[in-house]
């Protein structure tokens, strides 16, 4: 299953990065799982994941650094609290969970660049 | 003449971006000209330029947004005062001016990403 995502995104100076993850569904899925993975060197770690029913909202866990909205075969993902050290390749993984058959789709990754802001001068 | 430069550089939150431009000199040049070009769409504009004698310092004009140092076949370039709208591809062009023959080298460009900082809160 094909998954498209932008090649590059810049995080805002507040450490927030948003991008769209779009998938070409081969079937009529009613339950979809979206996972954001971070690839550094050959290590792949899960950043966040959410399962949603088509037509319903995308809900991440309360302590997740991700939020998102879904519209058809598009998911708008936002990652918050990013620091310069979090700069890296963020991969969108989409799984069509129900009904069977299961389908896996993995994007090529979005390179997110993060620049730490300069601290504001102390107010005297 | 081959010119190497990094593919991507992030400007600091102060709008400063630095990168190295390295060239493989086919002769014993004594006078070298370095130009930074910005490519946006199909438009190429000159950002700054400096001519230097080998072994001497690299001197840009006083009102230039660029500064730099040279060491052998390497030039360390710094561009200041960058804003988010200045994000783009910055190409390093090197010309061996003297003695003849003249040689031209153009790098593949460095994608400089710039994020505007959040304004600091007013001090009451």
């Amino acid at each position: 299953m094909h998954v498209a995502q932008p090649a590059v995104v810049l995080a805002s100076s507040r450490g927030i990065a948003s991008f769209v993850c779009e998938y070409a569904s081969p079937g009529k899925a009613t339950e979809v799982r979206v996972t954001v993975l971070r690839q550094a060197d050959s290590q792949v770690t899960e950043v966040c994941a959410a399962t949603y029913m088509m037509g319903n909202e995308l809900t991440f866990l309360d302590d997740s650094i991700c939020t998102g909205t879904s519209s058809g075969n598009q998911v708008n993902l936002t990652i918050q609290g990013l620091r310069a050290m979090d700069t890296g390749l963020y991969i969108c993984k989409v799984e069509l969970m129900y009904p069977p058959p299961y389908y896996l789709g993995i994007g090529n990754g979005t390179q997110i660049y993060v620049i730490d802001p300069e601290p504001c001068p102390d107010s005297d | 003449m081959h010119v190497a430069q990094p593919a991507v550089v992030l400007a600091s939150s102060r709008g400063i971006a630095s990168f190295v431009c390295e060239y493989a000199s086919p002769g014993k040049a004594t006078e070298v000209r370095v130009t930074v070009l910005r490519q946006a769409d199909s438009q190429v504009t000159e950002v700054c330029a400096a001519t230097y004698m080998m072994g001497n310092e690299l001197t840009f004009l006083d009102d230039s947004i660029c500064t730099g140092t040279s060491s052998g076949n390497q030039v360390n370039l710094t561009i200041q005062g960058l804003r988010a709208m200045d994000t783009g591809l910055y190409i390093c062009k090197v010309e061996l001016m003297y003695p003849p023959p003249y040689y031209l080298g153009i790098g593949n460009g460095t994608q400089i990403y710039v994020i505007d900082p959040e304004p600091c809160p007013d001090s009451d």
């Epitope: 799982r33 993975l37 792949v44 770690t45 899960e46 994941a49 399962t51 969970m97 299961y102 789709g105 | -």
Partner: antibody, heavy 118, light 108 residues
Amino acid sequence: QVQLVESGGGVVQPGRSLRLSCVASGFIFSSHGIHWVRQAPGKGLEWVAVIWYDGRNKDYADSVKGRFTISRDNSKNTLYLQMNSLRAEDTAVYYCARVAPLGPLDYWGQGTLVTVSS
Amino acid sequence: EFVLTQSPGTLSLSPGERATLSCRASQSISSNFLAWYQQKPGQAPRLLIYRPSSRATGIPDSFSGSGSGTDFTLTISRLEPEDFALYYCQQYGTSPFTFGPGTKVDIK
């Protein structure tokens, strides 16, 4: 480090039942799908079943559909395979295997042998 | 349902030689979600290569994967004594998650 340990295999008569377990450690169990894969003596690998994440979504090979049930208890980091109406052709080493973040099976247990014989 | 065919069934080679194993799918494999596993007698399978050219952690660079669509290849550039084993391909892009019948690489 990641570890998967199967248990519950043994000799059972045709038509009887058996439950296999697979205890996982060294990773966040609920973040991974887990498969059962079997290998009959001297034969190749055959996919049996998979269970995903919170345990609601499952898939089975046609050869075991309606007879085998895969389940998991995320609080115990344990995967199960309930095998009913066993047949001689179910005789195999049963492996549990973890789904890697990018999809393949990156860690496998050592396997447990199930022999269906009268 | 995907049917995976592996060839040859057995490959007889000497240490130091190059091994080329083939895996062919009955239909195009989505996003090239194909993996290769190695299995030695009495042991569980071990992941070697996935999608279809990324090496798994700890796998030496003598192992490489290539291919797309329906035709995939596992290459062992220089066979070491420990490389003589069974090799399976598997598609993992959609259920059912089929395996190929395997190729045995044995010592000539």
